[in-house]
């Protein structure tokens, strides 16, 4: 982590990807400690705060503006050397987001995947972005970068993620950058939750009063398991959003969640999954599918069982 003998290590916290108006601390680690250091910005855009200044421990930059985007290096204090300073550190790229319209992010074949599969995350925009960046929330390392391909007035890049393991599950966002300003990134795409299934035993799914009901009759789907899942997720075939509920321990030592669907009008095929609070994006195997059938004349379509979840709602704890 620390680089060469005479080379300090420059790092940023909380992240190298910083929104306009955010703050970032640059830390220059040298010779087993934080000594005095100087900061350099490698490109031509002038950041006057660094001119001839010496910093201790860390330098806090902010509120950041597009001019702060770029490559930084530091030199550590070395009093007994000829120059008084170390060799330059590793280059550290600070990317500033929020400078262009957000791109779109899609998952192919979809955001719900089995362990071991590969997913393509496609970032695209009608802004002619030269590069696209993909970033997973909570990861401190630099985002993946791809050159944008331009076809029919759309620029896009396909990021291949896989084979999928629990560590790759989470909330992804992508950004674009235009030529000549490679580190001034767009606003983030809407978040996309990548969920990995198939890691734990499947729960069981049942319907009350039963899987075949009269039109207008109230239906509740119950998901349960002997495994101590914290959350259950209910999905309906053909619908993008899932619904989730906290699992409740029952007297028979199972863990259960009851999803009220309201008055039945149209049927559908349902599945449920279990997950643990510590890994909200890693789900169990799917329950066996449950086909809910409605007899009689439905007057309108069944109310969606899943009011759309918040934009990045799946990979978040349920409180």
């Amino acid at each position: 982590l620390m680089g060469g003998q005479d080379k300090p290590f420059l790092s940023a916290r909380p992240s190298t990807v910083v929104p306009r108006g955010g703050h970032v601390a640059l830390q220059c680690h040298y010779r087993r400690g934080f000594n005095n250091f100087m900061l350099y910005k490698e490109d031509r855009s002038h950041v006057p705060i660094f001119h001839g200044r010496i910093f201790q421990e860390s330098f806090i930059m902010g509120p950041v503006t597009p001019a702060h985007a770029g490559t930084y290096r530091c030199r550590g204090s070395r009093p007994h050397s000829l120059t008084g300073w170390s060799a330059p550190s590793n280059p550290l790229v600070i990317m500033v987001t929020g400078n262009h319209r957000k791109p779109s992010l899609l998952a192919h074949p979809g955001p719900l995947l089995k362990s071991g599969e590969t997913v393509i995350l496609q970032c695209w925009s009608d802004v002619m972005f030269e590069h696209f960046f993909l970033h997973r929330e909570g990861i401190s390392e630099d985002p993946s970068r791809l050159v944008g391909q331009i076809h029919d007035g759309v620029s896009k890049a396909n990021f291949s993620i896989g084979p999928l393991m629990p560590v790759l599950a989470g909330t992804y966002r992508c950004y674009g950058s235009v030529p000549h300003s490679p580190y001034q990134l767009s606003a983030p795409s809407d978040p996309l939750d990548i969920v990995i299934t198939g890691l734990y035993e499947k729960p069981s799914l049942s319907a009350q009063p039963g899987p075949t009901v009269q039109a207008g009759e109230n239906v509740t789907l119950s998901c349960s398991s002997w495994s101590s899942y914290d959350i259950y997720h209910l999905s309906r075939e053909g619908e993008a959003h899932e619904r989730r509920l906290r699992a409740v321990p029952k007297v028979n030592r199972t863990f259960q969640a009851d999803f009220p669907l309201g008055p039945a009008t149209h049927g559908g095929t349902y599945r449920c999954f279990g997950s643990f609070r510590a890994l909200p994006c890693v789900w169990s195997n799917s329950s066996d599918p449950l086909l809910v059938s409605v007899t009689g004349n439905p007057s309108s379509s069944w109310p969606s069982p899943t009011e759309p979840s918040s934009k990045s709602g799946i990979c978040r704890h349920l409180h």
Epitope: R13, P14, S15, V18, P19, R20, G21, G22, H23, V24, A25, P48, I60, G62, P63, T65, T97, G98, E137, G138, T171, P191, S312
Partner: antibody, heavy 120, light 107 residues
């Protein structure tokens, strides 16, 4: 001690403009960014934008981009906000606030507020 | 833009009660969160910054906690002067949005 003194209440007609001030004292004006916050009657707080008095760099909430112009006079340690094309919806209390220092800074000092009433 | 969802929007409590107000960000804000108290006709006053740090002069009955997207302001034992409106605000990139506010009233 740090103080932010704002100009007095204003009553304006729709379509007019107004320029309000925030005079800073007790600290180095150019070392901190100055922010503006709006509060409509009975409503919550809305961030309008900020100016870095040292560089003149400004950034606005998109919602107020065409409405506000932020400036600063370093010789008098005063920040200004001009609101144009006033409408009744601009009736509010406008606060200036200093953004503190550190990695996780808050608005550590606030002005007392300038009440703007827009009415025909 | 980051949305800040504050709950509850109003709360009735008695002197001596323990009160908790929560604020949820639409994405990780890395503890870039402040809490303010506002009384009628007055400017907001800083209570807590960096999610957990008490501002100078703020009584120790106030405390902040949380990280990532979820944050809490707790008043351990309500005093008569604590009845006011409370706001959270994030600083992880502009616009620095506020929560909708929580009006704390005497029961």
């Amino acid at each position: 001690q740090v103080q932010l003194q704002q100009s007095g209440a204003e009553v304006k007609k729709p379509g007019a403009s107004v320029k309000m001030s925030c005079k800073a004292s007790g600290y180095t004006f150019t070392s901190y960014t100055m922010h503006w916050v709006r509060q409509a009657p009975g409503q919550g707080l809305e961030w309008i934008g900020y100016i870095n008095p040292s560089s003149g760099y400004t950034e606005n909430n998109r919602k107020f981009k065409d409405k506000t112009t932020l400036t600063a006079d370093t010789s008098t340690s005063t920040a200004y906000m001009e609101l144009s094309s006033l409408r009744s919806e601009d009736t509010a209390v406008y606060y200036c606030a200093r953004l503190g220092k550190g990695l996780l800074p808050p608005f550590d000092y606030w002005g007392q507020g300038t009440t703007l009433t827009v009415s025909s | 833009d980051i949305q800040m969802t504050q709950s509850p929007s109003s709360l009735s409590a008695s002197v001596g009660d323990r009160v908790t107000i929560t604020c949820r960000a639409s994405e990780n804000i890395y503890s870039n969160l402040a809490w303010y108290q506002q009384k009628p006709g007055k400017a907001p006053q800083l209570l807590v910054y960096a999610a957990t740090n008490l501002a100078d002069g703020v009584p120790s009955r106030f405390s902040g906690s949380g990280s990532g997207t979820d944050y809490t302001l707790t008043i351990s034992s309500l005093q008569p002067e604590d009845f006011a409106t409370y706001y959270c605000q994030h600083f992880w990139g502009t616009p620095y949005t506020f929560g909708g506010g929580t009006k704390l009233e005497i029961k």
